[in-house]
Interface confidence: medium
């Protein structure tokens, strides 16, 4: 037997990080992101509750709301109306997936400085919204969604298809929720009100996932989702737009779906409101390489949408999928007619394309071996875009503007230089026409919260600065995070390392990859982070890497689509190749280098554990994907293909972890799964610990009783945290 | 081919009631895109639409003229689309034009040959 050892940080009066810090969550940072109700006007909910109301302009500020409000109801969460005359307050939060969860919402009269009393809303709310001007609600309730033309007034009922997991009217059935929209709701006003948009949902033919939940019963619940896996029968979805002014009159209109889409199986992909009667649609194919934007109009004279073949823009994409992980949204100019978006130039970046007619004759905004990657604002004369362009750290995020009145347009960054060494990650939030914005950096130093003047980009004030955390760092000995890049052959790889305190090259180290490695993801970010892993090599003395292999982000087509129907080649390839690289540095004890990932990360660390290369000697998997049969249609075939004989089954069949079980009989392996896991179903893992035993291959696993993909409450997590801290220190010969 | 094919008109008492059929053949009218139209020409007076379906959503839309005394309907299996016209007066004297369009062109771009309606003691 080794003898154990045990890393000792020197000398140092500061002491190392804890499990218990990262637990109890005691190094958590705070943003601020101003609630804008105006062009200088924004709300904050305070350290107390109370909901404040900032004027930059004349530097007033007053609670609109108080905390004793929001208590009397027990409100987690508020809304104003645009009118200013109402607030609605949730409460009773009850998460069901990602982004959607139920609530109970009270109408709360600012004039009056009460309750609205009657016509009180229906519980639980499954969506509920403020028109664009004025205070009217919108409110999904069991499926169907509906209307009052102000607070007090009685409800009028827009849909009455709505049926549980049958037909889901304004919110997304699971899968469009995760793999599509992102979002809890399915509906969207016009800018002024009179129109109200919504997608319609028919999960009839859906195979349904059945899992059990435990509970403290004598019998098990079981969970019923209609859960397209990859193959099977998708959502039926269709898009309707009513009037609410007269709803009663004309009824819901659905905008028809482009011709060169409807021929086959397709999805919607967004709705944006260009004005008060255009609205912009997207759609694309199921196999998703082809993506159409469609512009329609509304026609009075018909009372009906018209898409015109002239206002329809095709995307799509030759080497692999059409968009980045989602397909991008366009942000349209005064106009109403032209717009910006950010696809793919014909070296294979995404960059901003400025589309007046035709998407043929897009004119290049930004160009260059980086990625644009988020329009924030078009104004009169300004785009505020996101990039990784400064520097050539793909990690790093910077706010740039771009003068559209000028010719040609001149170019900005506004956050390169603010803070160059706290601050190289940032995101901004902008008053309606940009008159002021937030800027939020989120590393690699302490996160900052900034507010900024729209014209001159000059900063007014600190919004928040994380003092309080800076001041409880003071005596922690935290690692030293470098990031990097590796050179193998003709590809280059971004990677992240967090070593030890007192780190010295001359030593040998263990070392723990963590890896996720999804299609269009990215881990090598210049973020600030005090997680499991810096407790890891603060306390534990561990070689942390993280490292960016092909099939993730921001570096160009050729580096995404590498992945395209072959997934499980490549991303295990690369962290492969980048720990011989990490060995070859010298100070990587050889015999102890272990792997974990979650979701993709727990596939990619399987497989990479299964590589037969012998240069891990233990590993984890939470969550892990097995098979890609067994994922959502829309993940799984935005990057397989379909699993048919005359498409991609063969690989689909030889991706599997399931395949690789032999592999698994020299290393030490702990599967990790929570029961209730309504994404990556609990059936991956039964499958990779059904195969496992029947090849008589040892290994440890875990499983949560009732817990989803996060494993999140806050017993689970302590129990898994402490059960992988002690399965690699036992891994690694390290003494508790 | 796309066509379009009227019946059921005739002539009629005032206070009495029609019921005009248009057959559709190579077009699906319950498809999205697809909106059916009864428009009416007489002699002297405007084109008129007096009424307009999109069989999928069964959305519909009347000329203030017609309200409430004329419903249009359509019926997907049968690929067909009714104007049931009660209440007639002197003034619905016209020739009925079935009409389709495919909103993804502007106008209504197919027509049948017209049904004429007579209300007339």
């Known amino acids: 037997l080794r003898p154990s050892r045990v890393y000792k940080p020197e000398g140092n009066t500061k002491r190392a990080l804890t499990l218990k810090d990262i637990l109890n969550g005691t190094f958590s940072y705070k943003t601020y992101f101003p609630n804008w109700i105006s062009e200088q006007e924004y709300l904050h909910q305070s350290e107390d509750d109370n909901i404040v109301f900032y004027n930059i302009e004349t530097r007033e500020s007053y609670i609109i709301l108080s905390n004793s409000t929001m208590k009397s109801v027990n409100a987690t969460d508020y809304g104003l109306s645009p009118d200013r005359q109402f607030v609605y307050l949730e409460s009773d939060y009850s998460k069901l997936w990602r982004y959607s969860y139920t609530a109970t919402y009270y109408i709360y009269d600012l004039q009056n400085g009460e309750f609205v009393r009657g016509y009180e809303l229906p519980r639980p709310i499954q969506y509920l919204c403020w028109s664009p001007v004025g205070s009217k609600l919108a409110y999904v309730y069991q499926n169907n969604i509906y209307l009052k033309q102000r607070p007090g007034d009685p409800p009028f009922q827009i849909t009455y298809t709505g049926r549980e997991n049958r037909i889901f009217n304004g919110i997304p059935d699971w899968v469009y929720e995760e793999e599509m929209l992102a979002t809890k709701y399915a509906l969207w006003w016009s800018p002024d009100g009179k129109f109200l948009a919504y997608v319609e949902f028919n999960d009839s033919d859906i195979p349904i996932i059945a899992y059990s939940y435990y509970g403290d019963g004598q019998y098990p619940r079981t969970i019923n989702i209609p859960y397209p896996k990859a193959g099977a029968k998708n959502p039926v979805v269709r898009v309707f737009i009513v009037d609410t002014t007269y709803p009663h009159h004309v009824g819901p209109m659905e905008v028809p779906v482009p011709e060169m889409i409807a021929s086959s199986d397709y999805y919607f992909s967004w709705l944006t409101w260009v004005s008060s009667e255009r609205v912009c649609l997207q759609w694309l194919k199921r196999v998703q390489n082809v993506s159409v934007l469609s512009i329609c109009d509304f026609r009075e004279d018909w009372h009906a949408w018209e898409c015109p073949k002239n206002q329809e823009h095709v995307e799509e994409s030759r080497t692999g999928w059409a968009g980045g992980f989602f397909v991008s949204t366009p942000a349209f100019s005064q106009d109403a007619t032209s717009y910006y978006k950010i696809f793919s130039d014909k070296d294979g970046y995404k960059h901003i394309h400025y589309i007046k007619d035709t998407v043929e004759n897009a004119i290049q905004i930004t160009s260059g071996k980086w990625e644009a990657i988020y329009i924030f604002r078009v104004t009169q004369d300004s785009l505020f875009y996101s990039s990784n362009e400064f520097e050539g750290y793909p990690g790093r995020r910077n706010i740039y503007r771009i003068s559209i009145g000028n010719s040609p347009p001149s170019k900005k960054c506004v956050t390169c230089h603010l803070r160059k060494e706290r601050c190289q990650y940032y995101t901004a939030s902008f008053s309606y026409k940009a008159k002021y914005y937030a800027l939020v950096c989120y590393g690699p130093g302490l996160p900052i919260s900034t507010l900024h003047d729209g014209r001159t980009d000059q900063e007014i004030q600190v919004l928040e600065e994380n003092k309080e955390l800076e001041n409880s760092l003071r005596n922690i000995q935290l690692p030293k995070v470098e990031i990097k890049k590796l050179k193998d052959g003709g590809l280059t790889f971004w990677y992240k390392m967090i070593l030890p305190p007192q780190f010295d090259r001359s030593k040998k180290y263990p070392l723990l990859i963590q890896v996720y490695g999804g299609p269009c993801s990215q881990s090598v970010k210049s973020v600030f982070a005090v997680n499991w892993i810096t407790y890891l090599a603060s306390k534990e003395g561990i070689v942390i890497a993280l490292v960016d292999g092909r099939g993730t982000a921001f570096q160009g087509d050729k580096f995404l689509h590498a992945v395209y129907r072959k997934l499980g080649v490549y991303e295990v390839e690369d962290q492969l190749t980048a720990v011989r690289k990490f060995i070859e540095m010298g100070f990587i004890d050889e015999e102890r280098i272990a792997i974990w990932g979650w979701s993709y990360g727990g596939y990619v660390s399987s497989l990479a554990l299964a590589s037969g290369t012998g240069l891990f000697k233990c590993g984890i998997a939470v969550a892990p994907v097995s098979s890609w049969e067994y994922y959502a249609s829309i993940y799984s075939e935005r990057f397989m293909g379909l699993p048919t004989k005359d498409d991609n089954l063969e690989h689909y069949k030889n991706s599997t972890v399931m395949a690789r079980a032999e592999y698994f009989r020299n290393v030490d392996y702990l599967l990790i799964h929570g029961t209730a896991d309504d994404n990556v179903h609990f059936q991956n893992s039964a499958q990779i610990a059904k195969a496992l035993v029947n090849a008589q291959v040892d290994f440890q696993a875990m499983w949560y009783s009732d817990q989803n993909h996060g494993i999140s409450s806050g017993r689970s997590q302590n129990h898994l945290y402490t059960h992988m801290t002690h399965f690699l220190k036992q891994c690694f010969s390290l003494s508790d | 081919e796309v066509q379009l094919v009227e019946s059921g008109g005739g002539l009629v008492q005032p206070g009495g009631s029609l019921r005009l059929s248009c057959a559709a053949s190579?077009?699906?009218?319950?498809?999205?895109?697809?909106?059916i139209g009864w428009v009416r020409r007489a002699p002297g007076k405007e084109e008129e639409l007096v009424a307009r379906?999109?069989?999928?959503?069964?959305?519909?839309r009347y000329a203030d003229s017609v309200k409430g005394r004329f419903t249009i309907s359509c019926d997907t299996s049968k690929n067909t689309a009714y104007l049931q016209m009660n209440s007639l007066r002197a003034e619905d004297t016209a020739v009925y034009y079935c009409?389709?369009?495919?909103?993804?062109?502007?106008?209504?771009?197919?027509w049948g040959q017209g049904t004429t309606v007579t209300v007339s003691s």
């Open positions: 009409a389709g369009r495919q909103s993804y062109n502007y106008g209504y771009i197919y």
């Open positions: 379906i999109q069989c999928s959503s069964g959305s519909t």
């Open positions: 190579g077009f699906n009218i319950k498809d999205s895109s697809t909106y």
